[in-house]
């Protein structure tokens, strides 16, 4: 599941990693755009082994993965779901 959140919270990420995570290990991705209390874009990845990590938005692999997910979400495929949540 790929989610884009617009929140008024401060930055969530303490440290960002650029280490590649295979898609089969990923359960959910959350994108927090910059602004609203945090000066940078944040990408949070939930892994299937019940761990959670912040990924460097500049990492090539996450950019490619998000592009694939965006394309799929705009097609007729039922999964993964692209959720735009605006409180």
């Amino acid at each position: 599941v790929l989610e884009v959140y617009y929140t008024s919270l401060r930055c969530r990420c303490v440290q960002e990693s650029s280490v590649f995570i295979p898609r089969r290990f990923i359960d959910r991705i959350q994108i927090l755009p910059r602004g609203n209390g945090c000066p940078r874009k944040e990408i949070i990845v939930w892994k299937k082994n019940k761990s959670i990590v912040c990924v460097d938005p500049q990492a090539e692999w996450i950019q490619r993965m998000m592009e694939v997910l965006r394309k799929r979400s705009s097609s007729t495929l039922p999964v993964p779901v692209f959720k735009r949540k605006i409180p």
Partner: antibody, heavy 122, light 107 residues
């Protein structure tokens, strides 16, 4: 307000099965990212992680005790359970349940129960 | 399993002292370390998370740091309410493992 409370027998005999219940409020184990763990502490000693159960029924155990541990949950009753088979004197300890929420920043065991003292004695 | 070697096991210090407690990890755990405070007869409570971040409501005299595989909890000016046991926990990978604990007493 998040609260957790452990319940179970205060005393049991060697070779018996210890059954503990964690009753909680202020969160739900049906919510994505929520988990409950069990930790124990022999009197005057350090903490030992035993097991975790997550919203999706994923379970993790301490390998040193995995053959004796079973963790489970009843989501609708807001309860988590731990069973330890074939108990012996070294299992005498205070047993805690604690909440974990898989959010960023991730702080496992951010809320704890008051603990329950369990004594194994013949 | 990752072993967490905590020292000292006990520590006696005076009010106003600066004290440091250390945990050494047997494998790389990055910043995935928490310090818990446990007051007598009470349950543990997080004071530092992700190695160096102050948990909500914790006084600023508490701080955490890392040097290689060594992780430290420092109290800059000891107060009587800091008398407690302190435990480190690594949560980089299962099984989660705690240090053996440090009992902090006031002289």
């Amino acid at each position: 307000q998040v609260t957790l409370k452990e319940s179970g027998p205060g005393i049991l005999q060697p070779s018996q099965t210890l059954s503990l219940t964690c009753s909680f409020s202020g969160f739900s184990l049906s919510t994505y990212g929520m988990g409950v763990g069990w930790i124990r502490q022999p009197s005057g000693k350090g903490l030992e992680w035993l097991a975790n159960i997550w919203w999706d029924d994923d379970k993790y155990y301490n390998p040193s005790l995995i053959n004796r541990l079973t963790i489970s949950k009843n989501t609708s009753n807001n309860q988590a359970f731990l069973k330890i088979t074939n108990v012996d004197a070294p299992d005498t300890a205070t047993y805690y349940c604690a909440r974990s929420e898989l959010v960023m920043p991730y702080v496992p065991f951010d809320f704890w129960g008051q603990g329950i003292m369990v004594t194994v004695s013949s | 399993d990752i072993q967490m070697t905590q020292s000292p096991s006990s520590l006696s210090a005076s009010l106003g002292d600066r004290i440091t407690i250390t945990c050494q990890a047997s494998q790389d755990i990055g910043i995935d370390l928490i310090w818990f405070q446990q007051k007598p007869g009470k349950s543990p409570w997080p004071v530092i998370y992700y190695t160096a971040n102050l948990a909500s409501g914790v006084p600023s005299r508490f701080s955490g740091s890392r040097s290689g595989s060594h992780y430290s909890l420092t109290i800059s000016s000891l107060e009587s309410e800091d008398m407690a046991d302190y435990h480190c926990l690594q949560y980089k990978q299962y099984p989660f493992t705690f240090g053996s604990g440090t009992k902090l007493e006031i002289k």
